[in-house]
């Protein structure tokens, strides 16, 4: 069955309880288009987003009878001049016979006569049609025969793509059968089909077809009123393109629509090869598309690579939204021409800033007031990250200009960054020098505190993605973040006490769920001590509120629960509820405080795993007093686990071993070269995983990767001398929790050569190890005490610089 | 072919106005635009705005906006600019060009000489 | 004073090739196309180049444009007496919102 055999069979279901082989049809109010009912139009009630009324006619083929209901009746079959008289096609049928056609349509053959409606005759210009009327044994005869086919085509033969030779010199007939049920010749309706004659069939259509012998170049090249648009096409290498074999559509601006186009946007595009090629290849579609094919909206792809949706008003074609077709269906050779009164601009074609629609005016003005605009060069390549209209408050608006420029300076990135470029974990450098991070989620994206939302665009010069909220990069740690906010005074002196400072003040990535003083609410001092003397107990609680990962509340997928792993093993449960976060089914007071090494969401109570049962009757006396929301168990004796310390902390042990320095005399001053190991240096981080393993169970973790040398001088009690750090990445057995980055870096005397080689190849996986940066060195004191044998209490930061060359293999690095 | 015609040289005092016609031949006026360009005496071409042949709209260069002002005559195929309160360093030679955008400028009139004397 | 800046001069002789240099900034030809005008003694000018290379036509192909960042340059090859005028280039300036023409080069033929 074809589209329009199908939609003929709705308009039967629609149409049969007014009685047998009768047809739903859909007439556009205040026109005379009528449509056989599709199904997305029948419940609309609409076709081109115009009312309806629904007329009942006798299908195709069927007539009424007096006194019956429907349409029970057969239509009599005749040949195929008899059938224009049958289907009402009466103007063609005396067309037919002025033009001594009628007996050719009488006698023997078989023929398919696409037969124009009398109100398409009417409809024809009337130059045109006098001149016809004037030469009908001709010009008349031509003109009909162009409208025939030398054999029955039924709308089931009428494939969509199809070019059919006409009666009339082979002149094509351009077949299109569109989904929606229409099917056009060169571009006119098939407003009633498949009128089966004795010797063919006849189809009626909505306009009198025009002869073509003409491409779209052609076409192009002869009317003035596109010599902007030849002219461009020619700027564009296109012209000659539009001259091929094909079925095209080309929506072609006029010279007004030219002169439309800001003029400094025409100059630039006009410039640029890319943009100007991209600009003319976004008017062009592959396909042939027949305005009356359009009763709804729909996207193509254009030439470009990119869709424009195409949809209509009444007897107006829009484009992207917008009518602008002045001009429909001009048939030429090898598709079909609308003449329309804007440009249309592809984002491709688009400067980065031009890129912003009506919901991020905010943004782009202020870029523009705050002399931003000027540091997008046409020659760079940016990023807008641009919050939409309402992230900007009145207070924010209203801050000191240098202020609100260091903000904006905060939305703009140096490269251009598209959205299939963003990766959870990624750091990209904004024009004011900031760095900002990625947390790519199931169903958000989000830079730093504010997730996008939906309208990315990549345009000539740059992309751009809209944010909710105005990106904030976070200035302090976690710890920091605490420690400065009196609500969190009790939390913080816990966590101290848990010895777990460390852990919130050093780099990484955490989601803390910080409970506030309210949480403690009742706790004596006593009781404090209860919890506090409990070690074990208070690290348990403590890191259930921590989770590895930066979770944003916005990226949390909405309306469902989501499963996180916290650092003490058991689960914690987030929910996403009209802009609050429900963590165990509690509310968050206050969500996506950004941290440098994570996020804090407050809550004001104290979170438990309830999976974990206490056995100390005292504690269980002040969690019960603390935690109303769970009933938490109880088995006596039971004690909780000891959480190792490797899973959250990062142990550094330091030998140094006094070097061999042997002294090579120069010309200007002696070069020092070292021999032997100069330092070791065994360095163990770890992180959590997920996954907690049980006693007994071991596990073997292979990470990957090859050995890693770092060479560089330090300076030791005045000494210069030469280290290299061996990063080397090898399986290991761990039991207990499971460490997800084991690092080992040992130092060792590698030829500059092997340096130079390493380097070369491992260049992107260097990372820094040693804290403290550049030429981090130890008090003398301290060197000394290790010389003697004993451990240094701590590292001690550098005061004196990495000398000479060799500092520029450091900084040469990756950080 | 294309053909602009300038009305004929002019001499102004300074403070009085001068308006220049272009009658366009050869194409479809409405079509294409007409910008105007000016050249003082060994000088260089400095452009003084745009008129629409289509509709009307204008664009002016900032220099000489609310002293200047272009209109057409889509009956007769005819371009005017008029200047305003003149000053001696007006007096140039005042060329009309077609100017259809895409392509910039690319037929011109003979050139009017205004002369601008007390 | 002209935005664009070029060369007063330049010369070569007959059936040589001689280059007409456009210098501008980010704003006109960092920006947007250049185009070429030839305005022989005593008449009106004359489009030569469009779009930084496009040739309208008429114009031989002895003319040849090119763009690059905020400069642009014209190049005579075959050089001919016709060809003594004077050649202004000419961006749109985004800042002034302007159509800026160079201050002119005059080409003589030796």
């Known amino acids: 069955n074809s589209y329009y055999d199908k939609v003929l069979a709705h308009s039967r279901i629609r149409g049969r309880d007014q009685g047998p082989n009768v047809c739903a049809l859909q007439q556009i109010l205040g026109t005379k288009k009528k449509y056989f009912s599709s199904c997305k139009n029948w419940y609309q009630g609409a076709i081109c987003g115009k009312k309806t009324t629904v007329l009942y006619e006798c299908c195709p083929g069927y007539m009424r009878m007096e006194g019956m209901k429907g349409c029970p009746a057969v239509m009599p079959i005749d040949h195929v001049y008899g059938t224009l008289g049958i289907v009402g096609a009466t103007t063609t049928q005396h067309y037919s016979d002025v033009s001594k056609l009628r007996e050719e349509i009488e006698g023997k053959g078989s023929y398919t006569y696409f037969a124009p409606s009398n109100e398409a005759w009417d409809n024809l210009d009337s130059d045109i049609r006098r001149g016809l009327e004037n030469n009908v044994n001709v010009e008349l005869l031509n003109a009909l025969h162009s409208h025939m086919v030398n054999k029955r085509m039924l709308t089931k033969d009428l494939k969509h793509g199809m070019v059919i030779p006409s009666m009339y010199n082979n002149l094509g007939l351009f077949i299109n059968h569109y989904p929606n049920g229409v099917v056009t010749v060169n571009c006119a309706r098939v407003i009633h089909g498949n009128q089966i004659a004795t010797n063919g069939v006849v189809h009626v259509i909505d306009r009198v077809l025009t002869q073509i012998g003409t491409s779209i170049q052609d076409f192009i090249e002869a009317e003035d009123e596109l010599s902007s648009f030849r002219a461009a096409a020619i700027t564009s290498d296109l012209l000659e393109s539009l001259g091929r074999d094909g079925h095209f559509t080309l929506f072609a601006p006029t010279n007004e629509a030219f002169e439309k186009l800001p003029r400094g946007v025409l100059e630039r595009i006009m410039g640029d090869k890319v943009a100007s090629e991209a600009l003319m290849k976004y008017h062009i579609l592959n396909t042939l598309q027949c305005s009356e094919a359009i009763t709804g909206g729909a996207v193509f792809e254009t030439m470009e690579g990119n869709t424009i949706e195409i949809g209509c008003e009444g007897d107006s074609i829009s484009i992207n939204g917008i009518k602008m077709v002045n001009k429909k269906d001009i048939v030429t050779k090898n598709g079909v021409i609308h003449l329309i009164d804007e440009v249309l601009i592809p984002d491709s074609a688009k400067q980065v800033i031009e890129l912003a629609g009506k919901q991020q005016t905010t943004f782009t003005d202020l870029v523009a007031q705050l002399g931003l605009a000027s540091s997008l060069k046409p020659d760079g390549e940016y990023t807008l990250l641009a919050p939409v209209n309402n992230a900007f408050s009145d207070d924010t608006l209203s801050m000191d200009q240098r202020l609100l420029k260091l903000i904006l300076q905060n939305h703009i990135l140096k490269v251009k960054v598209g959205l299939s470029d963003l990766y959870n974990g990624q750091i990209l450098e904004t024009i004011g020098g900031k760095q900002l991070r990625v947390f790519v989620y199931r169903t958000a994206i989000c830079i730093e505190n504010s997730c996008m939302v939906r309208g990315s665009k990549q345009g000539r010069n740059g992309a751009i993605h809209i944010f909710r909220e105005i990106i904030q990069p976070a200035e302090k740690s976690l710890h920091e973040k605490l420690r400065q906010d009196k609500r969190f005074s009790i939390f913080l002196s816990l966590l101290e006490a848990a010895d777990l400072k460390d852990l919130l003040t050093q780099p990484g990535d955490w989601t803390l769920f910080a409970p506030t003083n309210d949480a403690f609410k009742g706790m004596t001092n006593e009781e404090r001590e209860i919890l506090i003397g409990d070690k074990n107990a208070l690290q348990n609680i403590i890191l259930y509120h921590l989770t590895p990962g930066v979770y944003i509340g916005k990226g949390f997928e909405p309306g469902v629960t989501n499963i996180l792993k916290t650092t003490q093993g058991s689960k914690i449960y987030v929910k996403g509820v009209n802009e609050t976060l429900l963590v165990n089914e509690l509310k968050s007071k206050e969500s996506d405080i950004m941290t440098t090494n994570g996020v804090i969401h407050v809550v004001d109570k104290l979170l438990y795993p309830a999976d974990i049962p206490v056995g100390n009757d005292q504690l269980l006396e002040l969690l019960n007093k603390l935690i109303k929301y769970i009933q938490i168990k109880f088995v006596r004796g039971s004690t909780f686990k000891e959480i190792p310390m490797t899973v959250y902390t990062t142990k550094i042990i330091t030998k140094l071993v006094e070097p061999k320095i042997k002294v090579i005399q120069g010309s200007l001053q002696p070069i020092i070269k070292t021999e032997g190991p100069a330092m070791t240096k065994i360095h163990i981080e770890g992180e959590p995983d997920f996954r907690l393993i049980k006693e007994g169970e071991t596990v073997t973790e292979v990470i990957h990767g090859e050995p890693v040398i770092k060479k560089y001088t330090k300076i030791i009690d005045g000494v210069p001398v030469e280290i290299t750090e061996k990063e080397t990445r090898e399986e290991r057995i761990i039991t207990g929790p499971e460490i997800k980055y084991t690092r080992i870096s040992t130092g060792g005397g590698e030829t500059e050569e092997t340096l130079q080689k390493f380097l070369q190849k491992e260049v992107s996986k260097v990372t820094k190890f040693i804290e403290g940066g550049d030429g981090h060195l130890f008090e003398d004191e301290a060197i000394k005490r290790l010389l003697q044998g004993d451990t240094p209490a701590k590292k001690i930061q550098a005061n004196k610089r990495v000398q000479g060359s060799r500092r520029r293999s450091r900084e040469g690095r990756s950080q | 072919q294309v053909q602009l015609v300038q009305s004929g040289a002019e001499v102004k005092k300074p403070g009085a106005s001068v308006k220049v016609s272009c009658k366009a031949s050869?194409?479809?006026?409405?079509?294409?635009?007409i910008s105007w360009v000016r050249q003082a005496p060994g000088q260089g071409l400095e452009w003084m705005g745009w008129i629409s042949a289509y509709n009307g709209n204008t664009n002016y260069a900032q220099k000489l906006q609310g002293r200047v002002t272009m209109t057409t005559d889509t009956s007769t195929s005819t371009a005017y600019m008029e200047l305003r309160s003149l000053r001696s360093d007006d007096t140039a030679v005042y060329y009309c060009?077609?100017?259809?955008?895409?392509?910039?400028?690319?037929?011109w009139g003979q050139g009017t000489l205004v002369t601008v004397s007390s | 004073q002209s935005v664009l800046t070029q060369s007063s001069s330049a010369s070569g002789t007959p059936g040589q090739t001689v280059t007409v240099s456009c210098s501008g900034s980010s704003s006109d030809i960092g920006s947007n196309r250049v185009n070429w005008y030839q305005q022989l003694p005593g008449t009106a000018p004359k489009l030569l180049i469009y779009?930084?290379?496009q040739r309208p036509s008429g114009v031989p192909d002895r003319f040849s444009g090119s763009k690059s960042g905020t400069s642009a340059s014209l190049a005579i090859s075959g050089l001919q007496s016709a060809d003594e005028a004077d050649y202004y280039c000419a961006a749109w300036d985004d800042s002034l919102s302007t159509y800026v023409f160079g201050s002119g080069t005059k080409v003589t033929v030796l």
């Open positions: 050869g194409y479809t006026f409405t079509s294409y635009g």
């Open positions: 779009s930084n290379d």
């Open positions: 060009a077609r100017d259809m955008l895409v392509v910039p400028f690319d037929y």
